[in-house]
């Protein structure tokens, strides 16, 4: 996701407008506490990290407040006074949405209907993957806001739910990442059940670029 | 259809101030951010930065802080740039930007869709 | 700052002819690249977006490709209309762009 500079990836991570994690791996600065510097306005003085994330004992990353911040990241990774990285991004390309939140189903006859809580920004997609015991393996569909009707299902079969949220590739591009999963959800004849029989353990979102 | 409309010429002198207006339409105003872009006599594009017009928020470009000042008022639907202590190098095509695609509420990101026609300020004695 | 070079600056063709323009980026800039068209006394137009990705309206003779430092700007078979100023941008970070390249009737 960054560029090397002498030898530093940066992983950056936008999480629901709300906080920016960035994380370096400097193999030459493994045993280094590196610091890292920021800024929001390109003409501002740079703060250091308050809230960094450390990795066997060293620094690794930085957590930034960063609630709905309309702006570039202008940051610096730094050794002593010495800068190993510099760069600026804007925020948004990094988004990762939250989970979704109070998801529903509502049942008739041979259709379901999955709603959660919208988030507060648009451009996103809500998928919702479906399976029963004998699929062999998870069906999908999404729209744009969270509610989404699948419809043919078997009555009869049990079914695993689970709802996510990705932002548009379109609108904010190839370096967002997928919400986490929200619970799976078992459901047999319009009822809620602990599991279904044989379900295999679903894969886990792929968070990596 | 969205249209941004701006003023028209201005011919000024070194040390005075200009205030050049975007009159947005064709859409809701405090949805999307606005840019402001810089283009010298026969030379390239320059973006000078950008104002959140759902909250107010001024960003400037490296290079544009100071002199210049991106306002608003969202009643009538208009962005400004203020320029004061004009200098001859001043003298340039200043166009407002709309962006494209990401809304205010999650920020800018500088792709350019719409463009308003362009206002020439001629820094002269 | 992120610096962006065009190549050729300027560059004489034909209608029909298929043009290449070029643009370099002095760091990574994933796909985040937009190409304008400007015309004499007008503003620009967005044409292509995520490098590769063709702006609503814009004619299908306009292609991208690129990512990482390098894109490429094509126009398979040249219009009349296509004689203009076309700027590369990156939005990877504040917006920069190349400093153009003209393309003039031969």
């Known amino acids: 996701q960054g560029g090397a500079a002498e030898g530093v990836q940066i992983q950056i991570i936008y999480f629901n407008l709300e906080t920016v994690q960035v994380t370096w791996n400097a193999s030459k600065y493994s045993r280094t506490n590196l610091t890292f510097h920021y800024r929001f306005n390109g003409d501002e003085a740079y703060d250091q990290c308050t809230n960094y994330l450390l990795q066997e004992g060293h620094t690794s990353g930085c957590l930034l407040d960063a609630e709905q911040r309309d702006d570039i990241l202008y940051f610096s990774i730094r050794n002593g006074t010495h800068p190993v990285f510099t760069a600026s991004r804007w925020m948004v390309y990094y988004l990762k949405p939250s989970s979704p939140k109070h998801v529903r189903f509502s049942w008739h006859q041979d259709a379901v209907t999955v709603t959660c809580s919208d988030l507060s920004y648009g451009d996103l997609l809500y998928e919702v993957q479906y399976r029963s015991p004998f699929d062999t393996e998870w069906q999908s569909k999404q729209e744009n806001t969270c509610n989404v009707t699948i419809e043919g299902l078997d009555a009869e079969k049990c079914y695993s739910f689970w709802v996510r949220v990705k932002a548009m590739e379109d609108v904010y591009g190839p370096d967002t990442y997928p919400s986490d999963w929200s619970e799976v959800t078992c459901w047999q004849r319009g009822e809620i059940r602990d599991a279904c029989a044989e379900t295999p353990t679903p894969p886990k979102p792929k968070l990596s670029k | 259809q969205v249209q941004l409309v701006q003023s028209g010429s201005e011919l000024k002198k070194p040390g005075a101030s200009v205030k050049v207006s975007c009159k947005a339409s064709?859409?809701?105003?405090?949805?999307?951010?606005m840019s402001w872009v810089r283009q010298a006599p026969g030379q390239g594009l320059e973006w000078m930065g950008w104002?959140?017009?759902?909250?107010?928020?001024?960003r400037y470009a490296q290079g544009f802080t100071g002199r210049f000042v991106f306002s608003l008022d969202t009643s009538v639907s208009t962005a400004y740039l203020q320029i004061s202590s004009l200098k001859a190098e001043d003298t340039a095509v200043y166009y407002c930007a709309r962006e494209g695609f990401i809304r205010t509420v999650v920020g800018a990101a500088g792709r350019f869709v719409y463009w308003g026609q362009g206002t020439l300020v001629t820094v002269s004695s | 700052d992120i610096q962006m070079t065009q190549s050729p600056s300027s560059l004489s063709a034909s209608v029909g002819d298929r043009v290449t323009i070029t643009c370099r980026a002095s760091?990574?800039?994933?796909?985040?690249l937009a190409w304008y068209q400007q015309k004499p006394g007008k503003a620009p137009k967005l044409l292509i977006y995520?490098?590769?990705t063709l702006q609503s309206g814009v004619p299908s003779r306009f292609s991208g490709s690129g990512s990482g430092t390098d894109f490429t700007l094509t126009i398979s078979s040249l219009q009349p209309e296509d004689f203009a100023t076309y700027y590369c941008?990156?939005?990877?970070?504040?917006?920069?762009f190349g400093q153009g390249t003209k393309l003039e009737i031969k």
């Open positions: 064709g859409y809701t105003f405090t949805s999307y951010g």
């Open positions: 995520w490098a590769s």
């Open positions: 104002v959140n017009t759902n909250t107010g928020n001024p």
């Open positions: 941008q990156q939005y990877s970070a504040y917006p920069t």
């Open positions: 760091q990574d800039i994933h796909t985040r």
